[in-house]
């Protein structure tokens, strides 16, 4: 159980004050108006690996 607002969220997630919880930025596609999505816009998702050299 995370103390409110203390630990930073892992990459690809952002803090929701509304839910008192780190939330997965991927869910912003379905719910773009969630409060944590602003933090997702500021921190782009982890880079993907190319499948070829």
């Amino acid at each position: 159980e995370q103390a409110p607002g203390t630990a930073p969220c892992s990459r690809g997630s952002s803090w929701s004050a509304d839910l008192d919880k780190c939330m997965d930025c991927a869910s912003c596609r379905a719910r773009p108006h969630s409060d944590f999505c602003l933090g997702c816009a500021a921190a782009p998702p982890a880079p993907f690996r190319l499948l070829w050299p």
Partner: antibody
Framework: QVSLKESGPGILQPSQTLSLTCSFS??????????VSWIRQPSGKGLEWLAH???????RYNPSLKSRLTISKDTSRNQVFLKITSVDTADTATYYC???????????????WGQGTSVTVSA | DIVLTQSPASLAVSLGQRATISCRAS??????????MHWYQQKPGQPPKLLIK???NLESGVPARFSGSGSGTDFILNIHPVEEEDAATYYC?????????FGGGTKLEIK
């Protein structure tokens, strides 16, 4: 259609442990963003939020009661539980469970509530 | 904890007139983009019913005579025109931080 229903012992004695069950239908607690809260209301008085459990089993408690509260869930049975230890007459109230769930605009406040279960603590 | 103070504690409004209920928070429940304030209606023997979420967004099925406004520490619930079925107790609630707290309630009587 979403519905929630609370059940409890009705009457119990001081120092005992209160066990409450919230049985729900119409949504799944395995859905990302979903959660269930417990709220209580002494007769003729206001509302007090007690605890919340999330789809991923993360839990939150009201600090003023945290040492006495335990919230848990059985996702497969669509049930959420609350235990309050060492009850006193001040715990006499109607206890509600309520859902917080995701929608397009973000996350609902408590949008669906059960009818409540009355609990009396009396010697 | 954020304390929510509602005023008045009770009010009587004539049918068809405007009811205004205030909710003041002990500290801001808003950010630059969000106001985490919600309003509920409770009738005797019933659970609370969500009316307005995030300050001004009407819950589905709630009549348009209900409206909410405000930011920071000061919020308002307006009902206009008031109807008989609006007789109830109204509560504000915030979700800005834990613990989520409710106002003490405002009892609305229809004259």
């Amino acid at each position: 259609q979403v519905s929630l229903k609370e059940s409890g012992p009705g009457i119990l004695q001081p120092s005992q442990t209160l066990s409450l069950t919230c049985s729900f239908s119409g949504f799944s607690l395995s859905t990302s963003g979903m959660g269930v809260s417990w709220i209580r209301q002494p007769s003729g008085k206001g509302l007090e939020w007690l605890a919340h459990i999330y789809w991923d089993d993360d839990k939150r408690y009201n600090p003023s009661l945290k040492s006495r509260l335990t919230i848990s869930k059985d996702t497969s049975r669509n049930q959420v539980f609350l235990k309050i230890t060492s009850v006193d007459t001040a715990d006499t109230a109607t206890y509600y469970c309520a859902r917080r769930g995701p929608d397009y605009y973000g996350y609902y406040p408590m949008d669906y509530w059960g009818q409540g279960t009355s609990v009396t603590v009396s010697a | 904890d954020i304390v929510l103070t509602q005023s008045p504690a009770s009010l009587a409004v004539s049918l068809g007139q405007r009811a205004t209920i205030s909710c003041r928070a002990s500290k801001s429940v808003s950010t630059s983009s969000y106001s985490y304030m919600h309003w509920y209606q409770q009738k005797p023997g019933q659970p609370p019913k969500l009316l307005i979420k995030y300050t001004s967004n009407l819950e589905s099925g709630v009549p348009a005579r209900f409206s909410g406004s405000g930011s920071g520490t000061d919020f308002i619930l307006n009902i206009h025109p008031v109807e008989e079925e609006d007789a109830a107790t109204y509560y504000c609630q915030h979700s800005r931080e834990l613990p989520w707290t409710f106002g003490g309630g405002t009892k609305l009587e229809i004259k």
